[in-house]
Structures are given as structure tokens and as C-alpha cells.
């Protein structure tokens, strides 16, 4: 018999499909399962992020049995993908610690605002960045990162939560967006596409990049994520686009080389600590910034997004590994895990550099239409 491409009926993994069914349709996302760039930002398009308060942009919630972390993340609901991927019809044992935010997926039902009303908010993420319309803001100083170069021990948890791959970060990673705007890093995760299909969440003048990394931070003004949700500046995300380059990225390889071990949704492994800052662009001075939301349920607003102008280069093989290794719920490949871009609704994206004149990810006409909102800071 030809092995079906599902673990359930092949030695290759674990889903539930017909006994001798070769590659089942549910193994690959269908067109209607995946967001399309030209789609309007309708509710159905709101594919999201990952697993915490329902969003991969949030730290994962540890089970009660684990030690209480300094950020008390365990007070958040544990959000799992609905049902057991091997037994989709038998999911009564799941979700015990979760809430309705666990029941969402990229594309299709349920519409995200039904999962979390905030997903229908006016100031959502991701957005399309148009550098020529960004407001140059000299007050936006280079980002400051402290403690991001982690020693090999203690090891870090790398988890496939069914929506993304997420690396939980230890206490001590400090980030400042500016004076008095201090944060602690909680976790990082990635968004990607599929073969020949880019999967970044943010776009630049409509251009979608192959992938995107998000490093999620909690303001030092809050002790817990649930306190910060929905509060202006309570959470901050550093985002960078991943592009194809000629060489292997050794920093990313430390994570990508472990993905095969966590191919199954819900599985995790331990990886040696690494230099987290090496996963980001080297230029911390040139970036775009705006206030938006988590990109998955609960879609809480008030999130400060900082999107680097410089991209990170990965080899073609590395990008393929990222998009072709992991599996999500219901025995479907974990691919195209990005939300459609959302309307700005009057928001102005600020730039720490004169982006209208020199916008790197995508060149644009040198027009500066918006003024810096923080000019007086």
C-alpha cells in the first residue's frame, strides 16, 4: 500500500484519514483555507496567531502543574487547538483549561469576532505598510535590547502549538522602545506560507515576504499578560521579515534543525539557549511603528508593533524547512499561518527614519504626507 501522508495511516506521522488513502486532501490547505492577499479584511480572513490567550503573539500558558513563572502566565487560559489531531471526533478531553479562544483557525469558521469580539476592532493587526505615507519621527530612537544573548543552559521550550512554532523565553530579556517604555520578552514565534506562497503577516506596499518573526514583550508596568491585554502599550511586538538569501542562517538553524522533533501539533522539545537578538535584523535604528493588536484571537488591541526595515536572510532550504515540516490540528499541514492585513482606519504608521525617501523593503516615491505624532516628545 502507498502510505497516506498522514501519521494516522502511515509511518510518517499522525492524523486520522482513510486506511489506504494516499495523500488526503486535508493534508494541504485548500484555497479557501488560506488567506489571500487580495481578500478584503473580512472576518473570515482573520487567520490568527498562536496559542495563548488565543494568540501566538502571547506567551504560552503553562499547565498548573508547572512552576509559577515570575510573570504569572499560568493565570491565562491555556489555549490549545481544538480536538486531538488523531481523533478529531473525540475531543471531550481537550480544552478543559481553555476557553472559547481555543476554537479558531486560519480561514473558515468560526469567524474570529465570534471567538473574540476584539477581532472586529478598528485598530487591528497586521497592516500593509506604505513607507511613503509613514510619518518620519526623529524621536524614535534605536531599540535597546539587554540580556538577549542567552547561555546554552537552561534550555528553552520550543513548541508546535498547532498555529505556529513558539519559543518560550526566560526572564531577563529586557527591551526598551525608548525612555520609560520598557518591556520584558516573553516568547517568539513565526509566521510562514507554503511552497511558492509567501506568509508574512505584515506587508509592504502589498508585498508579502516569505515569513515573519514576532518577539512578544510585556510592559514592565504589568506583572501579568492578562492585566496588559487591551491596555495601550501593555504588549509590544518586534517583527521582522524573513527573506531568501544565499547562505544558511546559523542562528535560525538552531531552531529549524529541531522542527522535525515537534512536527506533531502539541509536541514540544527543549533547545539550548541562543542569542535571540541574532534572530533579528542587525539594524535596530530603522523601523516602522504603530499601535495595533494581537494577530490571532483574542486580537486584543493596544499592542505596540515595531516592524524592522531591514530583513533577515534565510537560505531557501531553511525557508522550505519552516513551511514544510510542522503539522497542525485535524492532520493538516501547518502552513499559511498568517492573518490578512487589516485597515488602518486612520492610524498613522511612524518611521524612525525618512522612509518616504529611502524605504528599503520596497522603494517608493519620496513623499512625506503624515507628520510625526510624537514630534513633541
Amino acid at each position: 500500500q502507498r502510505l497516506p501522508r498522514m501519521q494516522e495511516d502511515s509511518p510518517l506521522g499522525g492524523g486520522s484519514s482513510g486506511e489506504d488513502d494516499p495523500l488526503g486532501e486535508e493534508d494541504l490547505p485548500s484555497e479557501e483555507d488560506s488567506p489571500r492577499e487580495e481578500d478584503p479584511p473580512g472576518e473570515e480572513d482573520l487567520p490568527g496567531e498562536e496559542d495563548l490567550p488565543g494568540e501566538e503573539d502571547l506567551p504560552e500558558v503553562k499547565p498548573k502543574s508547572e512552576e509559577e513563572g515570575s510573570l504569572k502566565l499560568e493565570d491565562l487560559p491555556t489555549v490549545e487547538a481544538p480536538g486531538d489531531p488523531q481523533e478529531p471526533q473525540n475531543n471531550a478531553h481537550r480544552d478543559k483549561e481553555g476557553d472559547d479562544q481555543s476554537h479558531w483557525r486560519y480561514g473558515g469558521d468560526p469567524p474570529w469576532p465570534r471567538v473574540s469580539p476584539a477581532c472586529a476592532g478598528r485598530f487591528q493587526s497586521p497592516v500593509d505598510i506604505r513607507p511613503q505615507l509613514a510619518a518620519f519621527c526623529p524621536a524614535l530612537r534605536p531599540l535597546e535590547l539587554l540580556g538577549f544573548q542567552l547561555p546554552p543552559l537552561p534550555e528553552l521550550r520550543l513548541r508546535n502549538n498547532g498555529h505556529s512554532v513558539q519559543l518560550t523565553l526566560p526572564p531577563g530579556l529586557e527591551m526598551a522602545l525608548g525612555p520609560g517604555r520598557e518591556y520584558r520578552a516573553l516568547q517568539l514565534h513565526l509566521h510562514w506560507g507554503a511552497a511558492g506562497r509567501p506568509g508574512s503577516e505584515h506587508t509592504v506596499e502589498g508585498h508579502r515576504f516569505p515569513a515573519e518573526i514576532h518577539v512578544v514583550h510585556l510592559s514592565t508596568a504589568f506583572a501579568r499578560v492578562d492585566e496588559a491585554l487591551g491596555r495601550p502599550g501593555g504588549l509590544a511586538v518586534l517583527a521582522a521579515f524573513l527573506e531568501e538569501g544565499p547562505e544558511e542562517n546559523s542562528a535560525y538553524e538552531q531552531l529549524l534543525s529541531r522542527l522535525e522533533e515537534i512536527a506533531e501539533e502539541g509536541s514540544e522539545t527543549q533547545v539550548p539557549g541562543l542569542d535571540i537578538s541574532a534572530l533579528l535584523p542587525s539594524d535596530f535604528s530603522r523601523y516602522f511603528q504603530y499601535e495595533g493588536s494581537l494577530t490571532t484571537p483574542p486580537c486584543a488591541q493596544g499592542v505596540i508593533w515595531t516592524v524592522f526595515n531591514q530583513t533577515v536572510m534565510l537560505s531557501a532550504k531553511q525557508l522550505h524547512t519552516l513551511s514544510d515540516t510542522l503539522w497542525g490540528p485535524g492532520d493538516s499541514r501547518l502552513q499559511l499561518n498568517f492573518r490578512a492585513t487589516q485597515p488602518l482606519n486612520g492610524r498613522v504608521i511612524e518611521a524612525s527614519f525618512p522612509a518616504g525617501v529611502d524605504s528599503s523593503p520596497r522603494a517608493a516615491e519620496p513623499v512625506q504626507l503624515n507628520s510625526c505624532l510624537a514630534a513633541g516628545d
Epitope: 502510505l3 495511516d9 509511518p11 510518517l12 494516499p22 489531531p85 512536527a263 506533531e264 501539533e265 502539541g266
Partner: antibody, heavy 118, light 112 residues
């Protein structure tokens, strides 16, 4: 740590029965397909049986079909191999091994020895 | 059943020198999904097998980069760029494209 530990091997007469167990720890057992692989003394590896994560799909090597039964109890994080009508040629070290989506078997137990002899 | 044939049966190698093992399948290992589910395992004396390479050429985590896999269709090769003492053991190719899963007969790598 991710670990598989086999038990239940021993000396048995031809025609007899044995039940092997494999205790899994350090990973979400219920999410992975599992295999039994054996190795006769001084010989190579021979795949014996496969069971999918939810037990809905099971395969056996022709050499054991009708005599061996693979099963699992995810609540107990355990894999089993019930071996009946044992033959001399079933003498081997029996390993349980975890399957990856890539087709590779990434976690192996230390093995348990089954000796069929009169 | 797919028969996996490995050559050579034994490969005496000088420390620091390269080694190469071949594996031939009786039929193509390309799955209908486009992937080729050919892996390589190492079994050191007295130890259980250990996964080295999956899907022809992907090194499993923790495997030294001196190990590399290549090939396509029915013919595959495992190469060790510079053999070290800890590489002594038996190497097996294995196909997981079709049930029953089958292993090659093994190639013994030993130091001259």
C-alpha cells in the same frame, strides 16, 4: 527526557506466548505513531508492526501477521506487542520506536530480548 | 515489498578519511506527495539504532555535519566526510514510502 523502555521479554517455548510492553515518557505519546522493530542475533533490523497515533491504522510484517497483535494505551503512555504461536525465528531483540512525519524513527528503546527455544 | 540493498557489507576506513555507503531500492521511493522517505540509521555496538538522516538528506538534530545524505529515486548514498572513532558501527538505510517498512541489510564501518 524523551524515553522508551521495553519490558516483557524472556525465554519461551515454541508455540508459546509473550506480551511485550513499551513505556513512553518525556513526550506526548498520544500524538505519535509507533513501531516494533526486531533484530535477530547477529542480523540486521526487521520492521515488525506499526500502529497509528489513534490506533485506527495498524500494519504487520508478513512474517508475523496473524500471530502478533500491536496495541497501545495512551492513558498509560504504553505500547504493547502480544506475540502468540512463537517460533524459533522470532528470537530477537525487540525495540519499540517512535515514527516521525518524515518517515524516520527518531526515538528507540534499549530493547528487550525474546528467546524462543525448546 | 520494496527491497533495500546496501553496499558494501563492510567498510574498513582509516580515521580521518571519508567513507561512503550505498543503498538501492527495488523501486522508486518517491511518494505520491512528492517526498522521498529514505532515512539512514546508525547502530553502535551494543546500542539501539539512532536516526541520522531523514528524507534523503536532512540531518536529524544533534547529528554531526560530517554525515551527509544524497540520492534520488532508487539510489542513495550516505557519506562520512572524516571518519572518527565514534562512527564505528552498522549503518542501515530504511524506506518509509510504502508498507511494509524495510531496512537495508546494513553496512559495517570499522577502523583499519
Amino acid at each position: 527526557r524523551v524515553q522508551l523502555v521495553e519490558s516483557g521479554g524472556g525465554l519461551v517455548q515454541p508455540g508459546g506466548s509473550l506480551r511485550l510492553s513499551c513505556a513512553a515518557s518525556g513526550f506526548t505519546f498520544s500524538r505519535y505513531s509507533m513501531n516494533w522493530v526486531r533484530q535477530a542475533p547477529g542480523k540486521g533490523l526487521e520492521w515488525v508492526s506499526y500502529i497509528s497515533s489513534s490506533s485506527s491504522t495498524i500494519y504487520y510484517a508478513d512474517s508475523v501477521k496473524g500471530r502478533f497483535t500491536i496495541s497501545r494505551d495512551s492513558a498509560k503512555n504504553s505500547l504493547y506487542l502480544q506475540m502468540n504461536s512463537l517460533r524459533d525465528e522470532d528470537t530477537a531483540v525487540y525495540y519499540c520506536a517512535r515514527s516521525l512525519r518524515s518517515g524516520g524513527m527518531d526515538v528507540w528503546g534499549q530493547g528487550t530480548t525474546v528467546t524462543v527455544s525448546s | 515489498d520494496i527491497v533495500m540493498t546496501q553496499t558494501p557489507l563492510s567498510s574498513p576506513v582509516t580515521l580521518g578519511q571519508p567513507a561512503s555507503i550505498s543503498c538501492r531500492a527495488s523501486q522508486s521511493l518517491v511518494h505520491s506527495d512528492g517526498n522521498t522517505y529514505l532515512s539512514w540509521l546508525q547502530q553502535r555496538p551494543g546500542q539501539p539504532p539512532r536516526l541520522l538522516i531523514y528524507k534523503i538528506s536532512n540531518r536529524f538534530s544533534g547529528v554531526p555535519d560530517r554525515f551527509s545524505g544524497s540520492g534520488a529515486g532508487t539510489d542513495f548514498t550516505l557519506k562520512i566526510s572524516r571518519v572518527e572513532a565514534e562512527d564505528v558501527g552498522v549503518y542501515y538505510c530504511m524506506q518509509a514510502t510504502q508498507f511494509p517498512l524495510t531496512f537495508g541489510g546494513g553496512t559495517k564501518v570499522e577502523i583499519k
